[in-house]
Interface confidence: low
Amino acid sequence: KRFRDVLGHEQYPDHMREHNQLRGWSSDENEWDEHLYPVWRRGDGRWKDSWEGGRVQAVLTSDSPALVGSNITFVVNLVFPRCQKEDANGNIVYEKNCRNDLGLTSDLHVYNWTAGADDGDWEDGTSRSQHLRFPDRRPFPRPHGWKKWSFVYVFHTLGQYFQKLGRCSARVSINTVNLTAGPQVMEVTVFRRYGRAYIPISKVKDVYVITDQIPVFVTMSQKNDRNLSDEIFLRDLPIVFDVLIHDPSHFLNDSAISYKWNFGDNTGLFVSNNHTLNHTYVLNGTFNLNLTVQTAVPGPCPPPSPSTPPPPSTPPSPPPSPLPTLSTPSPSLMPTGYKSMELSDISNENCRINRYGYFRATITIVEGILEVSIMQIADVPMPTPQPANSLMDFTVTCKGATPMEACTIISDPTCQIAQNRVCSPVAVDGLCLLSVRRAFNGSGTYCVNFTLGDDASLALTSTLISIPGKDPDSPLRAVNEFDYKDDDDKLEHHHHHH
């Protein structure tokens, strides 16, 4: 049998193989040693007995999508039946005081690989070590500590395989420089020692994507925006656009990236070298945001030709229907047509090619509450003798849309521990003046937090207020008014940010 017969559900066309050579991998046309690594088909009854106490599940993940030329990493983790774990020596043991189907476990071995192997098994060059081989009969590597590696992992993709010894986890990275853009399948089969052979314990496969377009995400945030995920933002307040490029292997670290923004509101094209940008919409309506990300990456040199035209200076147009925008946080990968780019070995070439990424979103701009501030704080005259509570009148004003709801929260002086919260619908006049009367239980310093909200926005301001003791001459004092940044830093007096 050949590797492709044993591993390959995904048959890989011969004409594609020459374009997709993986360094250090071998062709799945190679022969598979069936004596050392018996082959079981799906449904074979031996699978259920291949592991003591249940089935081992292999979980395969990758950091796909990968831009052509970058590295993509695959990680396989083995999930053992309940109450089983791998110990420091690579043996599989039962966890102490864990209840499985057999009852409460003590710290007993499930598989004691190292104790079961006499040292002769591990010596090189003897007939007894002939079983310490991979399925293609290559001998195991012998780095320090290798005896603790109890599992053989066989990775298979693009008509090639890679063999690896490992413990309960294995990691493989491949460089995508010669690969064709498009979705591919990685399959992994995991074997465990069984006497002088290796039997399969788990099989897993996963789709990964190689793309010739830069995978781009954009997060959009705005002060006072009530719901960050609905793509509805407020007029006359800056929106912060932050571009995240999916580049886990840091392929683009040395490349200058340019960002071309069209906000769809006829403000023109903005070109920036910074991944964050602020933009303020001044009209209500629905707008189409378009971002093109461009960079030059190491790439194949064109074949020498006297009539080679210069490369185009404008980016290729994105296809008509790009994939999802922010609301589903997945990268904006465009269909690529899966063109095969024939790349020579470029290790000693210095050519660069342009790569583009696209993001688009349709955002709705509405009127919202832009700002809220406390205009006045007044002590409410109380009859004598004074009651325990002090009453205060706060006059709050806002800019922008008319609020539908007002909330006041009275907290400790750090503004961390809320003592009292009241929300109520409000009817405000066109000037957006709102009078709020609140009671304070005893003297001391309080943080008073006001939020005014409507369907789309929520604006906040806070003030520290000092309630005097019962001395009739002691004055009411507003200590200061401040806002919060996300980290609760207090800003200067009379700044009103959410």
Epitope: D230, I232, N266, L283, T286, N290, S321
Partner: antibody
């Protein structure tokens, strides 16, 4: 390819309502605006409003506020326009349309739905 | 809202002629204007976008010009299938507005 398929002709009584549908196919429905346009017999084109199917956001021209209500159902990739309190002035062909790649105007159009208001 | 004044409202011409239709906006709309052709019983079809760019599949005898508030559509060497209604549309801001239309008839 991009297609917008509208519902069939409607004959309705004055004072009632009608709901015209526009089923989109061949592209990601949430990523493009759907616009609605009115054309009375022998007359010009009149923009009614627009909906963003991704967020449900709408924008109407003043004269159609209260007359037209635009909605979208992402699960069926269908946009709807409901016209209420119908009068003979509402008798017209109604088109839905979708922008080109950068949503510059209307590159793709539905075939039109004729609404006739008559007693 | 932006008003679009299109002229003439109707005109007649002969095969092979060169004709020009104009559209004027009540404010600066940069180049955010499209032109459409419509034949009886059919939806409009996309001719020109961003004032000067030919839509896909449109013959090169159609051309657009202008920016700011004055725009024109020119058809050179008229052919029989060009006799139809023509509309301009501003997409500079909401609400979008169409010109009143021009009926091009054969002389």
């Amino acid at each position: 390819q991009v297609q917008l398929q509208q519902s069939g002709a409607e004959l309705v009584r004055p004072g009632t309502s009608v709901k015209v549908s526009c089923k989109a196919s061949g592209y990601a429905f949430s990523n493009h605006l759907i616009e609605w346009v009115k054309q009375r017999p022998g007359q010009g084109l009149e923009w009614i409003g627009v909906i963003n199917p991704g967020s449900g956001g709408t924008n109407y021209i003043e004269k159609f506020k209260g007359k037209a209500t635009l909605t979208a159902d992402k699960s069926s990739s269908t946009a709807y326009m409901q016209l209420s309190s119908l009068t003979s002035d509402d008798s017209a062909v109604y088109f839905c349309a979708r922008g080109a790649n950068w949503d510059v105007g209307f590159a793709y159009w539905g075939q039109g739905t004729l609404v006739t208001v008559s007693a | 809202e932006i008003q679009m004044t299109q002229s003439p409202s109707s005109m007649s011409a002969s095969l092979g002629d060169r004709i020009t239709i104009t559209c004027q906006a009540t404010q600066d709309i940069v180049k955010n204007l499209n032109w459409y052709q419509q034949k009886p019983g059919k939806p409009p079809s996309f001719l020109i976008y961003y004032a000067t760019e030919l839509a896909e599949g449109v013959p090169s005898r159609f051309s657009g010009s202008g920016s700011g508030s004055d725009f024109s559509l020119t058809i050179s060497n008229l052919e029989s299938e060009d006799f139809a209604d023509y509309y301009c549309l501003q997409f500079h801001e909401f609400p979008r507005t169409f010109g009143g239309g021009t009926k091009l008839e054969i002389k």
